[in-house]
């Protein structure tokens, strides 16, 4: 009765177990009772990343600059090329097949997490006591100016989009001692 299973680095063919080809190599011919599996290295710009019985190697991914892509890590015979996005852009998917411009946080929102090559900007609403008056992919919410520390008073309250406006102290409420 012929075998129905093989060990992990083998494959079943013609009722026998043949060695798989190592990563970086493709199958040229199956083994026989008396000859080993024949494998050949993948060519330039090709790869195979597992023990395999593939007769063709896979082409390395092309990082298309027209899509905002650039090479993050050059492929080898055992690994695919890894693409990332140009500065100011991020991948639209895990496979990084194209890029989009980083999102900016509108006035009233600040940057919680700056974008990377693979993730977009994360914005957060400015909480009470903080503001952002610009549309930016980098600026966090800024704290309102503390009028008190400048010996001034609040003349106009701040919002999530504007800073407080400070002004001089009310003279009537100020006691000056003249000597």
């Amino acid at each position: 009765e012929p075998p129905t299973a093989c060990r992990e680095k083998q494959y079943l063919i013609n009722s026998q177990c043949c060695s798989l080809c190592q990563p970086g190599q493709k199958l040229v011919s199956d083994c026989t009772e008396f000859t080993e599996t024949e494998c050949l290295p993948c060519g330039e710009s090709e790869f195979l990343d597992t023990w395999n019985r593939e007769t063709h190697c896979h082409q390395h991914k092309y990082c298309d600059p027209n899509l905002g892509l650039r090479v993050q890590q050059k492929g080898t015979s055992e690994t695919d090329t890894i693409c990332t996005c140009e500065e100011g852009w991020h991948c639209t998917s895990e496979a990084c097949e194209s890029c989009v411009l980083h999102r900016s946080c509108s006035p009233g929102f600040g940057v919680k997490q700056i974008a990377t090559g693979v993730s977009d900007t994360i914005c957060e609403p400015c909480p009470v006591g903080f503001f952002s008056n610009v549309s930016s992919a980098f600026e966090k919410c800024h704290p309102w100016t503390s009028c008190e520390t400048k010996d001034l008073v609040v003349q106009q309250a701040g919002t999530n989009k504007t800073d407080v406006v400070c002004g001089p102290q009310d003279r009537l409420r100020h006691h000056h001692h003249h000597h």
Epitope: P3, T4, A5, C6, R7, E8, K9, Q16, C17, S19, Q22, C31, T32, E33, F34, T35, E36, T37, E38, C39
Partner: antibody
């Protein structure tokens, strides 16, 4: 130190059941294919069963097919052999053994061998 | 199933002798053969894998050769600790099988 330790052997009546365990230490058993091999008193080695690293693939000697079941718990580094409908001819020392794939990237093909063996556990089937 | 036949079944030799054990397969197994040494009351110990590759830590007096159906294990100069039983095993396909063993005794 890389070690395998079998347990669960003993005396059992014909038709009875027994579950052998094999505890791996010093290495991650889940990364290796494993085997059970037995040796009847005064006799040679007989391969009994195989299990792949994930437990997905199993195979058995014709003499135990349908009666024995090999399994593993990789989270506990344990290998098992469930033996049912035991017969007198199953009397033997049972060894668990690690399958290793020897590979030199400069060579074309690798090779298998059983490089780590337990001390064995004795199973006696008798009335 | 693939049958392995070892010869001789037993042999007596002296320290310093050169000893050869053969293993014949019922069908071609390329170089998917291993050799083991077993001493009484102990588990087998891997000596050779892939028909001719020496396992780490095994003395260089042990060597293996052959491919296809005919294989040999050679001990170039017997040492007292080499007296044991030797088994060949095919790992070409399931079911994996062992030879019946060769008992090497001291003369």
């Amino acid at each position: 130190e890389v070690q395998l330790l079998e347990s669960g052997g003993g005396l059992v009546r014909p038709g009875g059941s027994l579950r052998l365990s094999c505890a791996a230490s010093g290495f991650t058993a889940g990364s290796y294919e494993m085997n059970w091999v037995r040796q009847a008193p005064g006799k040679g080695l007989e391969w009994v069963s195989y299990i792949s690293s994930s437990g997905e693939t199993t195979d058995y000697a014709d003499s135990v097919k349908g009666r024995f079941t090999v399994s593993r718990d990789n989270s506990k580094n344990l290998l098992y052999l469930q033996m049912n409908s035991l017969r007198a001819e199953d009397t033997a020392v049972y060894y668990c053994a690690r399958d290793v794939f020897f590979f030199d990237s400069s060579g074309d093909n690798g090779a298998y061998g059983m490089d780590v063996w337990g001390q064995g556990t004795m199973v006696t089937v008798s009335s | 199933d693939i049958q392995l036949t070892q010869s001789p079944s037993s042999l007596t030799a002296s320290v310093g002798d050169r000893v050869t054990i053969t293993c014949r397969s019922s069908q071609g197994i390329r170089s998917s053969l291993a050799w083991y040494q077993q001493k009484p009351g102990k588990p087998p110990k891997l000596l050779i894998y892939g028909a001719s590759s020496l396992e780490v830590g095994v003395p260089s007096r042990f060597s293996g050769s052959g491919s296809g159906t005919d294989f040999t294990l050679t001990i170039s100069s017997l040492q007292p600790e080499d007296f044991a039983t030797y088994y060949c095993q095919q790992l070409n396909s399931f079911p994996s099988t062992f030879g019946q063993g060769t008992k090497l005794e001291i003369k």
